[in-house]
C-alpha cells in the first residue's frame, strides 16, 4: 500500500490507523495515497512543521486521545483537500494563529475536550467553508466579538462544557446558516437581548445547565425555525409572557430543574408540534385555567417534584391529545372533580407522593382509556363508589402506602379490589391503617367484621363484581405502560451531550433516568 509504517495499519480503502502508547511522533513514511488518517491513543506530545506534507490527498485527519499539547503553525500545510480535522481529547491550551491556513476545503473542525483557554477571530478567519465547529469541553471563559464572523456557512457550533460567564450579543450575528447552537454546561447568568436574532435558521438551541436567571422577553423572537430548546437546570424563576410566542416549529422544550414559581395562562404560545413538556423540579405552586391550552398536540406533560397544591378545574383545557400526565411528588390535598375531564386520551396518570385525602367520585369520569393510575403514598382513607367502574383498559393501579380506614365503608372497595387483584401488582398491596386492631393487615383479605363498623352503611350499589383479567397471558410489572419508576427526563438526540444517570425512587416519571436536559 505504498509503504505503511510498522506502527500503523493501512487498508485498501486508503485508510491509515496508527494507535498505541509506543508512538511518540507522527509515523513515517505515510502512504502518499492516504485519504483517511487516524492517530489515536498515542504519546505524541507535539506536531512539528509539515508532518503530513506527502499526503496531500488526505480528506479526513483524526488526531485524538493523545498527549498533544503543542502544535507548530505549519503542521497542516499542504492539506488543501482536508474536509474533516479532529484534534479532540488532547491537551491543547493554545492554538497558534494561522494553524488552519490553507485548509480551504475544511468542513468539520473538532477541538473538543482540550484545555483551550481562549479563541481569537484570527483562528478561524481562513475557514470560510466550515460547517461544523466543536469547541465543547474546554476552558473558554469568553468568546471575543468577531470570533465566528467569517464562518458564514457554519451549521453546527458546540460551545458546551466551557466556563463562559457571558455572551456578547454580537458574537453570533453573522451565522445566518447555523442550525445547531450548544451552550450547555457553562456559567451563563443571563443572555442579552438580540444574541440569537441573526440565527434565522436555528433548529436547536441548548442552554441547559447554566445559571440563567432571567430570559429577555424577545430572546427567541427571530428563531421561527427553532425545533428544540433546552433550558433545563438553570435558575429561571419566571417566564416573560411572550418569551415562547414566536416558536411555531418547536417540538421539544425542557424547563425542568429551574426555579419557576408560576405559569401564566398562554405562556406556551402556539406550539402545534410540541409533544412533550418537562417541568419537573421547579417550585410551581398552582396551575391556573388554560395554562397549557395552546399545546393541542401535547402527549406528555411532566409536572412532578414541584410544590403544586392547587390545580384550577380548567388547567388542562386543550390537552385533548395528552397520553401521560405526571403530577407525583407535589403537595396536592384535593382535586376538583372536573380537572381531568378534557383529557379524553389520557393513558397514564401519576399522582403518587402527594397529600390527597380523598378523590371526587367523577375524577376519572371522561378518561375512559386510562391504563395506569399511581395513587400510592397519599393520605387516602377510602375511595368513592364506582370510581374505576368504567376504566376497562386499566391494567395498573397502585394504592399502597395510604392510611386506608377498614371499617364497613371500605367493603365495596375491598370487594372490587378482590376481583381485580392483577391490576394492583404483586409486589406491594394496600394495607389497613385504622382501626388500630386491623392495622397492617391487607385491605384485600381483611375481615371487615373484625373492624369497627362505621356510623352509616351506604345503601348504594357496590363496585362491579366482574373479575378482570389482562389480555396478555402473563402480567409482569415490568411490561406495564407506566411503571412506578418513570422516565425522568427526555433523552435528547445528540450524543455528545447525553449523560445517563440512574436515580432512586424519587425519580420523576414515577424507568431509569436518561437525563440530558
Amino acid at each position: 500500500y505504498h509503504g505503511c509504517p510498522s506502527e500503523c495499519t493501512c487498508s485498501r480503502a486508503s485508510q491509515v490507523e496508527c494507535t498505541g502508547a509506543r508512538i511518540v511522533a507522527v509515523p513515517t513514511p505515510l502512504p502518499w495515497n492516504a485519504m483517511s488518517l487516524q492517530i489515536l491513543n498515542t504519546h505524541i506530545t507535539e506536531l512539528n512543521e509539515s508532518p503530513f506534507l506527502n499526503i496531500s490527498a488526505l480528506i479526513a485527519l483524526r488526531i485524538e486521545k493523545n498527549e498533544l499539547s503543542r502544535i507548530t503553525p505549519g503542521a497542516f500545510r499542504n492539506l488543501g483537500s482536508l474536509r474533516y480535522l479532529s484534534l479532540a481529547n488532547n491537551k491543547l491550551q493554545v492554538l497558534p494563529i494561522g494553524l488552519f491556513q490553507g485548509l480551504d476545503s475544511l468542513e468539520s473542525l473538532l477541538l473538543s475536550s482540550n484545555q483551550l483557554l481562549q479563541i481569537q477571530p484570527a483562528h478561524f478567519s481562513q475557514c470560510s467553508n466550515l460547517k461544523e465547529l466543536q469547541l465543547h469541553g474546554n476552558h473558554l471563559e469568553y468568546i471575543p466579538d468577531g470570533a465566528f464572523d467569517h464562518l458564514v456557512g457554519l451549521t453546527k457550533l458546540n460551545l458546551g462544557k466551557n466556563s463562559l460567564t457571558h455572551i456578547s450579543p454580537r458574537v453570533f450575528q453573522h451565522l445566518g446558516n447555523l442550525q445547531v447552537l450548544r451552550l450547555y454546561e457553562n456559567r451563563l447568568t443571563d443572555i442579552p437581548m438580540g444574541t440569537f436574532d441573526g440565527l434565522v435558521n436555528l433548529q436547536e438551541l441548548a442552554l441547559q445547565q447554566n445559571q440563567i436567571g432571567l430570559l429577555s422577553p424577545g430572546l427567541f423572537h427571530n428563531n421561527h425555525n427553532l425545533q428544540r430548546l433546552y433550558l433545563s437546570n438553570n435558575h429561571i424563576s419566571q417566564l416573560p409572557p411572550s418569551v415562547f410566542m414566536q416558536l411555531p416549529q418547536l417540538n421539544r422544550l425542557t424547563l425542568f430543574g429551574n426555579s419557576l414559581k408560576e405559569l401564566s395562562p398562554g405562556i406556551f404560545g402556539p406550539m402545534p408540534n410540541l409533544r412533550e413538556l418537562w417541568l419537573y423540579d421547579n417550585h410551581i405552586s398552582s396551575l391556573p385555567d388554560n395554562v397549557f391550552s395552546n399545546l393541542r398536540q401535547l402527549q406528555v406533560l411532566i409536572l412532578s417534584r414541584n410544590q403544586i397544591s392547587f390545580i384550577s378545574p380548567g388547567a388542562f383545557n386543550g390537552l385533548t391529545e395528552l397520553r401521560e400526565l405526571s403530577l407525583h411528588t407535589n403537595a396536592l390535598q384535593d382535586l376538583d372533580g372536573n380537572v381531568f375531564r378534557m383529557l379524553a386520551n389520557l393513558q397514564n396518570i401519576s399522582l403518587q407522593n402527594n397529600r390527597l385525602r380523598q378523590l371526587p367520585g367523577n375524577i376519572f369520569a371522561n378518561v375512559n382509556g386510562l391504563m395506569a393510575i399511581q395513587l400510592q403514598n397519599n393520605q387516602l382513607e377510602n375511595l368513592p363508589l364506582g370510581i374505576f367502574d368504567h376504566l376497562g383498559k386499566l391494567c395498573e393501579l397502585r394504592l399502597y402506602d395510604n392510611p386506608w380506614r377498614c371499617d364497613s365503608d371500605i367493603l365495596p372497595l375491598r370487594n372490587w379490589l378482590l376481583l381485580n387483584q392483577p391490576r394492583l401488582g404483586t409486589d406491594t398491596v394496600p394495607v389497613c391503617f385504622s382501626p388500630a386492631n386491623v392495622r397492617g393487615q391487607s385491605l384485600i383479605i381483611i375481615n371487615v367484621n373484625v373492624a369497627v363498623p362505621s356510623v352509616h352503611v351506604p345503601e348504594v350499589p357496590s363496585y362491579p363484581e366482574t373479575p378482570w383479567y389482562p389480555d396478555t397471558p402473563s402480567y409482569p410489572d415490568t411490561t406495564s405502560v407506566s411503571s412506578t419508576t418513570e422516565l425522568t427526563s427526555p433523552v435528547e438526540d445528540y450524543t455528545d451531550l447525553t449523560t445517563i444517570q440512574v436515580t432512586d425512587d424519587r425519580s420523576v416519571w414515577g424507568m431509569t433516568q436518561a437525563q440530558s436536559g
Epitope: 397529600r355 385525602r357 380523598q358 399502597y400 402506602d401 406491594t428 385504622s434 388500630a436
Partner: antibody, heavy 120, light 112 residues
Amino acid sequence: EVQLVESGGGLVQPGGSLRLSCAVSGFSLTSYGVHWVRQATGKGLEWLGVIWAGGSTNYNSALMSRLTISKENAKSSVYLQMNSLRAGDTAMYYCATHMITEDYYGMDYWGQGTTVTVSS
Amino acid sequence: DIVMTQSPDSLAVSLGERATINCKSSQSLLNSRTRKHYLAWYQQKPGQSPKLLIYWASTRESGVPDRFSGSGSGTDFTLTISSLQAEDVAVYYCKQSYNLPTFGGGTKVEIK
C-alpha cells in the same frame, strides 16, 4: 413488645457520610411506616423523612438531596443514609413509628436514639 | 414548607396551676373535606424520647391524662395543662402534618 433500636452513630468527619440503622421488633415493616427525626443538643425536633410499609418515601425538602431512607423487611431494619455531613448535622437521631395512634403521621413509639457527632 | 412558631419559649407555672402553650402555623392546617386540623402535640421529658400527646388538634392519644387538652383552629392552636403536675416538667412541641411534617421550636415548662 414493640421496640425500635437505633445504631450506627459516632464520630464522622465533615464531608463524610453516615448510615444509621433502626432495628425493629414487635411489628412488621410490611405493615408499618418508620420515621426518622433528629435533635441537636438543647435544640428542637426536626423531621427527616419516612419510609412507608410499601417502600414509598417522603423527605424533608431541605435535606432531600443528602438523605436516603431504605429498609430490608426480612431483617426488620430501616436505614438512614446521609451524605456531605457538616457540623450542623451533629444530633441525636431517632426512629419512630405509628403503632396505635390514628394520626397517620403520628409517632407514638420511639427508639432511644443514637448520637452522631460531625467533627474533624 | 409550613413554619410552626411556638410561644412562649419557656414557661414557669406553680404546681396545680394551668399552663398554656401556643402554636401558630404559617398557613391553615384545616382540610376542608376531612374537617380535620392536622396538628399534633408532643412531650419530651429530660433525657427521654418524645411522646405523642394529642393529634388532630384536640384528640388525646390513648393513655394521656385528661389534664392535657388541645384546642384551636386555622392557624392558631393551644395546648393546655389544666393542673400542672411535677411529672409534666418537659419540653412541648407542636407539629403540623398538613404538609410534610414540621415541628415548632418547643416550649419548656418548669415548676415555679
